[in-house]
């Protein structure tokens, strides 16, 4: 049975500012023909045909919904990309995580200027600081890292907030041992 | 009021093993990085490492890097410094530190120091 | 890394005003605005003076001020008093890996 394609990031992040490039591949196995993908953003069918799918310059449009599809497959889950204009966005490597896998967060600054005094904050309680920009690690995510993040930071000697990212850990299936 | 208590002077021989200690009161000792600096009889200070007892994110000085070990125990509010083979030039008085936070640069409180004596 | 650089000795009498310089390199001194400044009496812990290289805590004396040009630091002690007479220690912020770096003492006294 062919297997769903999946939507993967390139860089790793759904949220990124006005003007970054960033590039959705689909991903499957056996999935050998040139120009047999097909691209939608927002349900509408993009002129794009190739796995790979780049977005330079982004803009404002291009935030909402893709999914990809190879030849007759189902289509893939969706993903969702949002960009946005702001000094400090909080990016995520996932905003929905299984228990057990990591996650990654980052204090990204407008047009990647530098950014100090960088403070992490879950559910309005400070959670990591340094002295320059830095990222914050989980290895093993539990379901107590669920919860409202975003973080703070001097850019050009003056302290910004970034928007609130929700975050939500949820627990790994059980697999199901059937008696004989 | 907030403090770092550290524990006592030692004496010990070259070659043991040895874990001093830093305990925080009066604070969420979890949200602040706690460093540790040596003073070698007459000498200045140094830098060795600083770790972040929230996670155990640590930090060496090159000086120190593989010489000791820094690790904390959040549940009971302590930092230690500790070594697998002492020598003769590890004599000198430790001090744990507490950053200021929230990025500010600085380290506010100091432990009242622990002196280390190794003998050859 | 190399200790940051200041004087050995700094004298003044009562009343008078000092200053302390720590000299380093533009991946230390000059390419942050994270200086530290500390005061150690003989047989006590150092006590911080001054943080992100201007920043009082408020217990400290008024007395205490601190500025930065360049690759160089600099701490002025105004109204000098017989209780100032310590070492003085500047630090600065070097890299994520190594954050803290020590000058190499100054010794202040009070004639």
């Known amino acids: 049975v062919p297997q769903k394609p999946k939507v993967s990031l390139n860089p790793p992040w759904n949220r990124i500012f006005k003007g970054e490039n960033v590039t959705l591949t689909c991903n499957g196995n056996n999935f050998f023909e040139v120009s047999s993908t097909k691209w939608f953003h927002n349900g509408s069918l993009s002129e794009e045909t190739n796995s790979s799918l780049n977005i330079v310059n982004a803009k404002f449009e291009d935030s909402g919904e893709y999914k990809c599809q190879h030849q007759q497959v189902n289509e893939s889950e969706p993903v969702y990309l949002e960009v946005f204009s702001d000094w400090l966005l909080l990016q995520a490597s996932a905003e929905v995580v299984m228990e057990g896998q990591p996650l990654f967060l980052r204090c990204h600054g407008w047009r990647n200027w530098d950014v100090y005094k960088v403070i992490y904050y879950k559910d309005g309680e400070a959670l990591k600081y340094w002295y320059e920009n830095h990222n914050i690690s989980i290895t093993n995510a539990t379901v107590e890292d669920s919860g409202t993040y975003y973080c703070t930071g001097k850019v050009w000697q003056l302290d910004y907030e970034s928007e609130p990212l929700n975050i939500t850990v949820i627990k790994a299936p059980r697999e199901k041992y059937w008696l004989q | 009021e907030v403090q770092l208590v550290q524990s006592g002077a030692e004496v010990k021989k070259s070659g043991e093993s040895l874990k001093i200690s830093c305990k925080g009161f009066?604070?969420?000792?979890?949200?602040?990085?706690i460093g540790w600096v040596r003073q070698m009889p007459g000498k200045g200070l140094e830098w060795m490492g600083i770790i972040y007892p929230g996670d155990s994110d640590t930090r060496y000085s090159p000086s120190f890097q593989g010489q000791v070990t820094i690790s904390a125990d959040k549940s009971i509010s302590t930092a230690y410094l500790q070594w697998s083979s002492l020598k003769a030039s590890d004599t000198a008085m430790y001090y744990c530190?507490?950053?200021?936070?929230?990025?500010?640069?600085?380290?506010?409180?100091w432990g009242q120091g622990t002196t280390v004596t190794v003998s050859s | 890394q190399s200790a940051l650089t200041q004087p050995a000795s700094v004298s003044g009498s009562p009343g008078q005003s000092i200053t302390i310089s720590c000299t380093g390199t533009?991946?230390?001194?000059?390419?942050?605005?994270?200086v530290s400044w500390y005061q150690q009496h003989p047989g006590k812990a150092p006590k911080l003076i001054i943080y992100?290289?201007?920043r009082r805590p408020s217990e400290i004396s008024n007395r205490f001020s601190a500025s930065k040009s360049g690759n160089t630091a600099s701490l002025t002690i105004s109204g000098l008093q017989a209780e100032d007479e310590a070492d003085y220690y500047c630090?600065?912020?070097?890299?994520?890996?190594?954050?803290?770096?020590f000058g190499t003492g100054t010794k202040v006294t009070v004639l």
């Open positions: 533009s991946s230390d001194i000059g390419g942050y605005d994270f």
């Open positions: 009066g604070y969420t000792f979890t949200r602040n990085w």
């Open positions: 630090s600065s912020y070097t890299s994520s890996s190594t954050p803290y770096v």
């Open positions: 992100d290289v201007t």
């Open positions: 530190a507490r950053d200021v936070g929230n990025g500010d640069y600085g380290l506010d409180v």
